[in-house]
């Protein structure tokens, strides 16, 4: 039950990802860390940073509302259990300036491709019976 | 069970104010987005006002921004709406819903509005 | 803001008929974002359909949501006497209601 709601959150991020990337022109047009290729046992260490962006409303107003709310939505914090299962690695990943800045529409893309292949690790685990996702 | 009760409704002059509430029960009520959704005799769905769960967060629509103002009370686990220098067009019944989305990760994830009350009636009338 | 246009306004079925009701959005949306409600008269509305084609806890099979983009769409498969009604789509974040399709008996 807890795993298929974790499952649902992760694939809910991916929704709002895909539709804030519909809003790329009235959002600020700022560079955020954006990390990719992220090395194994840091995916949780990226998310983080992901998630400490400053990602911003150019406040156009037509579409501001929605995109306030679809940005707060993805700083939804995952409990603390899940955000490691505490990797092992995680004091020897980047820090989030240490990654590389990009416009918001290449950062919500990079996002997404975080998030998709943490849903694929969480699926692969659990099909090999680990934990340690 | 999960349920959501309007009050403060009535009969009201053009300019003045009125305080509705919205009396949430059966759920973890401090998890929850809140809603106000109104509905003009004989017309359609109009959103009002949301609340974040924790208060941090308010939007409105357009028609009463700078007139209500929402809040919360979630030691109480009611939802309240100040409205003020009211119009005629502001006649309708009001409804109080909860939003589908918790503040918990393993909670419910719906984007929709899933508990509604019955609603109130204001009318603004001279 | 985002603009849902339901149609049609009005649609006269007969009970065991199929119902087709469209809901177009002005700008792209999310699948996820996208809801539909039920509201008989006097009553509240209820959630429907969440997430473009979710169920909500309770709601028969009979009713199914799809569509993607700007165009959404609700069908009633067997339309029964208690799901003569009013049907509204929004979408999530802005909480943008169409203006509602009426189902009514022929």
């Known amino acids: 039950q807890g795993q298929d709601r974790h499952m649902i959150r992760m694939r809910q991020l991916i929704d709002i990802v895909d539709q804030l990337k519909n809003y790329v022109n009235d959002l600020v047009p700022e560079f955020l860390p954006a990390p990719e290729d992220v090395e194994t046992n840091c995916e949780w260490s990226a998310f983080s940073c992901f998630q400490k962006a400053q990602l911003k409303s150019a406040n156009t107003g037509n579409n501001e509302r929605i995109i306030n709310v679809s940005i707060k939505k993805l700083k939804r914090k995952p409990p603390s259990t899940n955000a490691g299962r505490r990797q092992k690695h995680r004091l020897t990943c980047p820090s989030c300036d240490s990654y590389e800045k990009k416009p918001p529409k290449e950062f919500l893309e990079r996002f997404k491709s975080l998030l998709q292949k943490m849903i694929h690790q969480h699926l692969s685990s659990r099909t090999h019976g680990s934990e340690d996702s | 069970q999960v349920q959501l009760v309007e009050s403060g409704g009535g009969v009201v002059q053009p300019g003045r104010s009125l305080r509705l509430s919205c009396a949430a029960s059966?759920?973890?009520?401090?998890?929850?987005?809140m809603h106000w959704v109104r509905q003009a005799p004989g017309k359609g769905l109009e959103w009002v006002a949301f609340?974040?769960?924790?208060?941090?967060?308010?939007y409105y629509a357009d028609s009463v921004k700078g007139r209500f103002t929402i809040s919360r009370d979630n030691s109480k686990n009611t939802l309240y709406l100040q409205m003020n220098s009211l119009r005629a067009e502001d006649t309708a019944v009001y409804y109080c819903?909860?939003?589908?989305?918790?503040?918990?990760?393993?909670?419910?994830?719906?984007?929709?509005?899933?508990?509604w009350g019955q609603g109130t009636t204001v009318t603004v009338s001279s | 803001e985002i603009v849902l246009t339901q149609s049609p306004g009005t649609l006269s079925l007969s009970p065991g008929e199929r119902a087709t009701l469209s809901c177009r959005a002005s700008?792209?949306?999310?699948?996820?974002?996208l809801a539909w409600y039920q509201q008989k008269p006097g009553q509240a509305p209820r959630l429907l359909i969440y997430?473009?084609?979710s169920r909500a806890t309770g709601i028969p099979d009979r009713f199914s949501g799809s569509g993607s983009g700007t165009d959404f769409t609700l069908t009633i498969s067997r339309l029964e006497p208690e799901d003569f009604a009013v049907y509204y789509c929004?979408?999530?974040?802005?909480?943008?209601f169409g203006q509602g399709t009426k189902v009514e008996i022929k």
């Open positions: 609340i974040w769960y924790d208060g941090s967060d308010k």
């Open positions: 819903a909860r939003d589908g989305d918790s503040s918990d990760w393993y909670g419910d994830y719906y984007f929709g509005m899933d508990v």
């Open positions: 059966g759920f973890t009520f401090s998890a929850y987005g």
């Open positions: 929004q979408q999530y974040g802005s909480w943008t």
């Open positions: 997430g473009a084609s």
């Open positions: 700008q792209s949306v999310s699948s996820s974002y």
